[in-house]
Amino acid sequence: KSPIFGPEEVNSVEGNSVSITCYYPPTSVNRHTRKYWCRQGARGGCITLISSEGYVSSKYAGRANLTNFPENGTFVVNIAQLSQDDSGRYKCGLGINSRGLSFDVSLEVSQGPGLLNDTKVYTVDLGRTVTINCPFKTENAQKRKSLYKQIGLYPVLVIDSSGYVNPNYTGRIRLDIQGTGQLLFSVVINQLRLSDAGQYLCQAGDDSNSNKKNADLQVLKPEPELVYEDLRGSVTFHCALGPEVANVAKFLCRQSSGENCDVVVNTLGKRAPAFEGRILLNPQDKDGSFSVVITGLRKEDAGRYLCGAHSDGQLQEGSPIQAWQLFVNEESTIPRSPTVVKGVAGSSVAVLCPYNRKESKSIKYWCLWEGAQNGRCPLLVDSEGWVKAQYEGRLSLLEEPGNGTFTVILNQLTSRDAGFYWCLTNGDTLWRTTVEIKIIEGEPNLKVPGNVTAVLGETLKVPCHFPCKFSSYEKYWCKWNNTGCQALPSQDEGPSKAFVNCDENSRLVSLTLNLVTRADEGWYWCGVKQGHFYGETAAVYVAVEERKAAGSRDVSLAKADAAPDEKVLDSGFREIENKAIQDPRLFAEEKAVADTRDQADGSRASVDSGSSEEQGGSSRHHHHHH
């Protein structure tokens, strides 16, 4: 499929001008290659009319130009003094005309309306309001006022001052007669339809002395704004419908076959399943405008979108609307990353988040999409060292591996963590991406003790058992804080005896805290990684208490305090289940746990969003067992 995009249809009137914008992926090759506008012939082929290399056909001499905007990835063709001869099928493209790197554009130039003398022209957008003003003389002040529409050869009464309203205009038309000082009456038509367009006649009086005024009403279907976005990226539709519909339900819909427009989201709480987890409807401004953000763009998201206002929350005749034509560029600069990531309850996930590598200094964020209130996304962690209070000890955002990717690790997973998460930065908003976390059944990989109590001044040794499948991985211990997880020295104690079907390649790696102080209290993680790519983690909370008896503590799995809601095996081990979510390049030998298919099912996560949500920090551990 060609990555070139432009308007499918361009309509204009004789004598007018058009400006046609064509989009292309802004690679260095594309930015500098030839741009052209050509007319398609009946037998195929495409005859160049103008190009970026300076060629202008004699047909366009003095009335057309082509301008390239390489920084935007667009070029614009302006054509003036249009005639009906300009109607036809064209292509805008890059390179050689026959190469296929092009987009088909249909140009329709129509004859201007043949208007009667003294005709007032009203040009109004679909769904809006028009006021047709009708002057009259004093002698007709007390006589009947009326508005007719010319249908074919005959005028058809639309409204009059005696109370008649044509059924086609019921509920959306009124006739106002100004105060005695002004010799004027006006007809106001709301929620304009395309079928309202045409010639109208105002009349005051019914005899030969009546006053008449011609009006031509042109109802404009909104020209779609072209939107060119990358696959896997995001788009924002800003919808400004005007203050007159500020209190009317708003919607965004996508046109399917014919005139059908399927609701994507509306302010009445409806949301299309295909957009679950990747859409936010932002509240409207006081002028009635609102915006819709869609992330994780897919090929099938391409198409025509309309936003509008109607009490039903969907497109109806007479809805004021705005239109966009979305093109999803498959030659995306946004790298592929898993859209579904799976983790076992009690285990961890490591999610890779792409960002624009030109913005390495940008602040990184991770938020949890909530379906309530038309979609919203409370932040959970950022790269400035803030972590939402409920996530202390189990969530970390790491700048690694860098160069266009950061990592988010979430451990101690529960079913409540299932849901959609967004990767964000304060830089390029097109790089918002979405990942769904699913909680699955499974067994743990890493084994650590339950929460541990250390004694002030003594030595504490905490074990972490790694199965043989991780023999080639770097094993580490670190201390969690709200800026990350600081690596600590650890000792390889040789093969682990915690695994039944595991050979000498299993490992027991211990963390030793010498001369424990109050500062040692907190969360500790053991985990595996390869270079800057993180795999599974398991978390242990270490509490510190006053000395009771001398000596050091060597915490075995059996001796560790198991929390009440934790499973203690016959062997005395507390299992931290850690199946999943690694970078697929890293954990190729495991079953495919990073599922890159787009899926929109799965249960929602429900995270409290009370007033404590700003309180980060790493000193409160009231919610832990110790």
Partner: nanobody
Framework: QVQLVESGGGLVQAGGSLRLSCAAS????????MGWFRQAPGKEREFVAR????????DYADSVKGRFTISRDNAKNTVYLQMNSLKPEDTAVYYC?????????????????WGQGTQVTVSS
């Protein structure tokens, strides 16, 4: 955690204008929905206006629509409330608040960071 400090309050005559500022420190406010609330003597704290992370979406209480404008400058880590055509009933302590929501609808109870407030008095 973000710390918020309001300024710009004072005494003004009915029909006059004031511009309140809310300076944030501790972390950048980009990822925050920011809001203004007010509390008149003997009354509950009420919502005045809110603005999303990018500044593209705002929302106002009916009582201030068309008179007050909320804006933000993420580079300066500051939020503003421009108050025009002030009325005596606008007299209150005005509080700046922040909510760590990237986007979307945010209810009043979702605001978790608060400033100390600045007094606005409108005389008739």
């Amino acid at each position: 955690q973000v710390q918020l400090v309001e300024s710009g309050g004072g005494l003004v005559q009915a029909g006059g204008s004031l511009r309140l500022s809310c300076a944030a420190s501790g972390r950048t406010i980009y990822g925050y929905v920011m809001g203004w609330f007010r509390q008149a003597p003997g009354k509950e704290r009420e919502f005045v206006a809110r603005i999303d992370w990018s500044g593209s979406s705002t929302d106002y209480a009916d009582s201030v629509k068309g008179r007050f404008t909320i804006s933000r400058d993420n580079a300066k880590n500051t939020v503003y409330l421009q108050m025009n055509s002030l009325k005596p009933e606008d007299t209150a302590v005005y509080y700046c608040a922040g909510s760590a929501y990237y986007s979307g609808y945010v209810t009043h109870r979702d605001f978790g960071s608060w400033g100390q407030g600045t007094q606005v008095t409108v005389s008739s």
